[in-house]
Amino acid sequence: YDFTNCDFEKIKAAYLSTISKDLITYMSGTKSTEFNNTVSCSNRPHCLTEIQSLTFNPTAGCASLAKEMFAMKTKAALAIWCPGYSETQINATQAMKKRRKRKVTTNKCLEQVSQLQGLWRRFNRPLLKQQ
């Protein structure tokens, strides 16, 4: 999906009001020094591409994020504020239902959510290179 035509300001508002708080809840008890951000993004569409990938694609050691509250709210925000996004996700959702597993918060998942917080941070404040 090409995130270029999303309403970035509406997504940002949704992030600040709810999604960010759910991410903080998920990370509660984790030291702020624990994880270094290794995934980066260069502009808002790129940030959303990376956010979608980390939130909804199962990775080795962390297969369960898609059912978390922050993920469901992320999905809703993208569906509402990115034209045509929900249509592209129908097949992905059906595949995810088949893969559904018991929710387990592993250290790998905590690291992944820390990366997500970093991607959202850059989505909110893209630091463009000065000309």
Epitope: K12, S40, F123
Partner: antibody, heavy 119, light 107 residues
């Protein structure tokens, strides 16, 4: 807990340079932007620029372009702001500040470094 | 650059009063506005981000509102520790700029 510890007060002559340090602790230094803000005596806050400690990317206010250099040392979790060709109007308190978890504000500030420029 | 204008520049009020400070942006900044409180000789402290979200540990008597170009910070019942200078700042795009400040004094 998160702390930004700045270097001590400086007295400089017009035309000289000053380098202010901001040592971060209590968080992953490279994950968050560091901004620099100054405040002249009895005046408001003035944004100077920002650095991404991970990449070294910077963005400076037009007003300070050519006179300011912001750097970061990842090994010591320290950000630096160097201002050159000093003039009396540069006399101010200089603050470093860390961007918040959400990237939508500054949640922690240094205590400030007072710079006096006088002949 | 986006200009931020605060009003009033100073304000006298009493403990228990309800006060509102306003901030105007020279162009649409959506909800990308922050409010800080600063006391003499101290660094500013974050009160509100995203125009209406209260920062951790900030008393509920503070509230922010607005979007686009017009914003306000309201203190519902002034407490002695609230007498300070308040600044808005846009967080829309680099370069960021601060408002001119509002000094809140005891009447």
């Amino acid at each position: 807990q998160v702390q930004l510890q700045q270097s001590g007060a400086e007295v400089k002559k017009p035309g000289a340079s000053v380098k202010v340090s901001c040592k971060a602790s209590g968080y992953a230094f490279t994950n968050y932007l560091i901004e620099w803000v100054r405040q002249a005596p009895g005046q408001g806050l003035e944004w100077m620029g920002v650095i991404n400690p991970e990449s070294g990317d910077t963005y400076y206010s037009q007003k300070f372009q050519g006179r300011v250099t912001m750097t970061a040392d990842k090994s010591t979790s320290t950000a630096y702001m160097e201002l050159s060709s000093l003039r009396s109007e540069d006399s101010a308190v200089y603050f470093c500040a860390k961007e918040s978890l959400t990237g939508s504000s500054y949640d922690y500030w240094g205590q400030g470094t007072t710079l006096t420029v006088s002949s | 650059d986006i200009q931020m204008t605060q009003s009033p520049s100073s304000l006298s009020a009493s403990v228990g009063d309800r006060v509102t400070i306003t901030c105007r942006a020279s162009e649409n900044i959506y909800s990308n506005l922050v409010w800080y409180q600063q006391k003499p000789g101290k660094a500013p402290q974050l009160l509100v981000y995203g125009a209406r979200n209260l920062a951790d540990g900030v008393p509920s008597r503070f509230s922010g509102s607005g979007s686009g170009t017009q914003f306000s910070l309201t203190i519902s019942s002034l407490q002695p520790e609230d007498f300070a200078t308040y600044y808005c700042q846009h967080f829309y795009e680099t370069p960021l700029t601060f408002g001119t400040g509002t000094k809140l004094e005891i009447k």
